[in-house]
Amino acid sequence: MAVTACQGLGFVVSLIGIAGIIAATCMDQWSTQDLYNNPVTAVFNYQGLWRSCVRESSGFTECRGYFTLLGLPAMLQAVRALMIVGIVLGAIGLLVSIFALKCIRIGSMEDSAKANMTLTSGIMFIVSGLCAIAGVSVFANMLVTNFWMSTANMYTGMGGMVQTVQTRYTFGAALFVGWVAGGLTLIGGVMMCIACRGLAPEETNYKAVSYHASGHSVAYKPGGFKASTGFGSNTKNKKIYDGGARTEDEVQSYPSKHDYV
């Protein structure tokens, strides 16, 4: 029950996170005009990954796309790439995790397959979240650098008479959405990985008793449908005490761990 809850919660958190990453990527307010020097500006500038916008106090907003690809800063291209990779990985992760959910029955899919899929989607969510956090952080770093550079040459004058105020940009709402969304996707991914451990049928989950017949050992495992002579390639006569405590030299074969329904 706890495993299902953890898996379900991980899925929901990741879903919210990825939706947030998509929203952040599409948002225009990655950087917004700093109003510190002019809080009553009649023209407000803000920029996204795909276009820049100008909102006039009259109520009119005009947005222009970045129609050039080669003319854009390498950092912006890198941020775009990170965000897209994050979205793609997240979307694939969501698709995989839907089939991995314990509450959804698909044919005669074994728990081993579900465990593997849960782990795969968890890793995808973690990488997706990291991509988003990295992308947003790179952009934020770029903003901070440009902010202090433009502050250094804030006013350039002609004989001290005419002032040209350089527009400075600060963190926009999309950055915070991206950070939170990336964090949620990361947390969701971690939860999926934790759920995977619970889905995987470990021997330690069961108390096992060995009944010795003449010449060979047959281990009857309560809760399982299969009785086997030992586990995997381990055919040594060995008593299993205290829930299947094992010696270090014993071979663990993972496929056989998951071979019951």
Epitope: V40, A42, V43, Q47, E56, S57, S58, G59, V162, Q166
Partner: antibody, heavy 118, light 113 residues
């Protein structure tokens, strides 16, 4: 078509409060800013106040912002300018105008002349 | 506040003349976001409300004759009337639309020579 019409008292005594109303039609208020501008006799135009299209922001001339209040009444399609503590220096023709693209004022009312005298 | 200085304050011209009015601002009116200059030109006749001629320094308002043109960038702007018509004798104002307060220039009165 777009029309704007200012209304208010023609004569006001010093220290009194002036309330000017701009009634408009032909456009949706939420899409445009609305401004008040005045022109003392024989002098240049002077911008006084603006209320943004959404109504969230109001802007005033710094020297007069303590005395001026701009507000709107969406249901009546009106923008109201209230001026407290009127002074003879406030004698002017008051215009209301619609603020459009480029923050330019594309439509103006005919203006209302206000004289401040005891 | 941005100060707007217009010159000349009065201009005498004849019908058919090419007229140029200059407007200077104390700060740049060029917005880096869209590379547009937030300067507007108005025409006002005695006893009438001002009429919008040009916004964004060079964009002519619809219905305004093509003889009116605006140019300039940053802090220096000009309004040009290519061939003065009898209907053009009026006072012209430039206005800063970039930053509040939205200051007007002192005006240029174009009168018959």
């Amino acid at each position: 078509q777009v029309t704007l019409r200012e209304s208010g008292p023609a004569l006001v005594k010093p220290t009194q409060t002036l309330t000017l109303t701009c009634t408009f039609s032909g456009f949706t208020f939420s899409s445009y800013g609305m401004s008040w501008i005045r022109q003392p006799p024989g002098k240049a135009l002077e911008w006084l106040a603006t209320i943004s299209g959404g109504g969230s922001y109001t802007y005033y001339l710094d020297s007069l912002k303590d005395r001026f209040t701009i507000s709107r009444d969406i249901s009546k399609n009106q923008v109201v300018l209230t001026v407290t503590n009127m002074d003879p220096a406030d004698t002017a023709t008051y215009f209301c105008a619609r603020q459009s693209r480029g923050n330019a004022m594309d439509y103006w009312g005919q203006g209302t002349t206000v004289t401040v005298s005891s | 506040d941005i100060q707007m200085t217009q010159s000349p304050s009065t201009l005498s011209a004849s019908v058919g003349d090419r007229v140029t009015i200059t407007c200077k601002s104390s700060q740049s009116l060029l917005n880096s976001g869209n590379q547009k200059n937030y300067l507007t030109w108005y025409q006002q006749k005695p006893g009438k409300a001002p009429k919008l001629l040009i916004y964004w320094a060079s964009t002519r308002e619809s219905g305004v004759p093509s003889r009116f043109s605006g140019s300039g960038s940053g802090t220096e702007f000009t309004l040009t009337i290519s061939s003065l018509q009898p209907d053009d004798f009026a006072t012209y104002y430039c206005q800063n639309d970039y930053s509040y307060p939205l200051t007007f220039g002192g005006g240029t009165k174009v009168e018959i020579k």
